[in-house]
Amino acid sequence: QPSCRQEEFLVGDECCPMCNPGYHVKQVCSEHTGTVCAPCPPQTYTAHANGLSKCLPCGVCDPDMGLLTWQECSSWKDTVCRCIPGYFCENQDGSHCSTCLQHTTCPPGQRVEKRGTHDQDTVCADCLTGTFSLGGTQEECLPWTNCSAFQQEVRRGTNSTDTTCSSQ
């Protein structure tokens, strides 16, 4: 059995040249003719040189999985899905995303260091001593309140709560 060159495919004991991306094999090569190729029908594609008798079906971006169509399918490129705003891609296969997760909400005591994108989750960071955050989408931790000379500090601030002052 012969081993075919790269971008050739085996038919019986003959090696045939592959079709270009965007095409599929209509008729395999013979003594006098090379591989006859046909364009991929609508909603199908081949992304690489290939020996396929049929083009591959275009992917569908499922909104129930948090996906939206970012780039329509073409005869030589599969559909590119992206996550809807507020979500990031959990399972990325090349340029294709199959499932999305909601961006993490930073807990109290942390601030948003890096906002989430379509392909990255939110990055949270702890508040430094002397500051606090209620969490959520807050990008800056707020400084604790300094009780005035006429106020008494009832409870010291934490990374998630402000200082409590009394007016007595």
Partner: antibody, heavy 118, light 108 residues
Framework: EVQLLESGGGLVQPGGSLRLSCAAS????????MNWVRQAPGKGLEWVSA????????YSADSVKGRFTISRDNSKNTLYLQMNSLRAEDTAVYYC???????????WGQGTLVTVSS | EIVLTQSPGTLSLSPGERATLSCRAS??????LAWYQQKPGQAPRLLIY???TLQSGIPDRFSGSGSGTDFTLTISRLEPEDFAVYYC??????????FGQGTKVEIK
């Protein structure tokens, strides 16, 4: 003797249309795929379009897709190329050529000149 | 899309000399390569198909070789009528049918 004779070329304005014909003789016309190949002045050869023997399968180069249509009338032994929305870059000698399946071209006509200019 | 690159662009030789023309494909086209000769003001003429098969009526001083990506057209002894432009064409995977850019063989 195989003969291919093109006609229909001429001067046309950009955006205009033209229909080329190729009269074939000396072989069983319906048994062969037929092609149009063009050559811009001083340039190389560029395949334009192909049609199967029955006329059921047609292919075109990306550069002419949606503008040029290849067809044939096997009862008249004639190949056609309908050219619409012509551009300056379509200026060339257009040859019709007999194909071995969608392979090489064993016989060529003498060509007809299409000039697209305002 | 497959690209065919012919070299050299121009070959300056004298009658009686041997001419070697090269055609390289960007990916394998098997043995499915043809060579054509074109003289000024004339249509191309098929010389060789299937990389090495001589078209009927073509003198045997013309020969072709190669497969896959590298092909050669050889004219063993140049005759005055052989000075012309030569094109290679792949039909290993078509459409589209692709031609090389041509090699001009001129008198030195």
């Amino acid at each position: 003797e195989v003969q291919l004779l093109e006609s229909g070329g001429g001067l046309v304005q950009p955006g205009g249309s033209l229909r080329l014909s190729c009269a074939a003789s000396g072989f069983t016309f319906s048994s062969y795929s037929m092609n149009w190949v063009r050559q811009a002045p001083g340039k190389g050869l560029e395949w334009v379009s192909a049609i199967s023997g029955s006329g059921g399968g047609t292919y075109s180069a990306d550069s002419v897709k949606g503008r040029f249509t290849i067809s044939r009338d096997n009862s008249k032994n004639t190949l056609y190329l309908q050219m619409n929305s012509l551009r300056a870059e379509d200026t060339a000698v257009y040859y019709c050529a007999r194909g071995k399946a969608y392979g090489y071209f064993d016989y060529w006509g003498q060509g007809t000149l299409v000039t697209v200019s305002s | 899309e497959i690209v065919l690159t012919q070299s050299p662009g121009t070959l300056s030789l004298s009658p009686g000399e041997r001419a070697t023309l090269s055609c390289r494909a960007s990916r394998s086209v098997g043995k499915y390569l043809a060579w054509y000769q074109q003289k000024p003001g004339q249509a191309p003429r098929l010389l060789i198909y299937a990389a090495s098969t001589l078209q009927s009526g073509i003198p045997d001083r013309f020969s072709g070789s190669g497969s896959g990506t590298d092909f050669t057209l050889t004219i063993s002894r140049l005759e005055p009528e052989d000075f012309a432009v030569y094109y290679c064409q792949q039909y290993g995977s078509s459409p589209p049918v692709i031609f090389g850019q041509g090699t001009k063989v001129e008198i030195k």
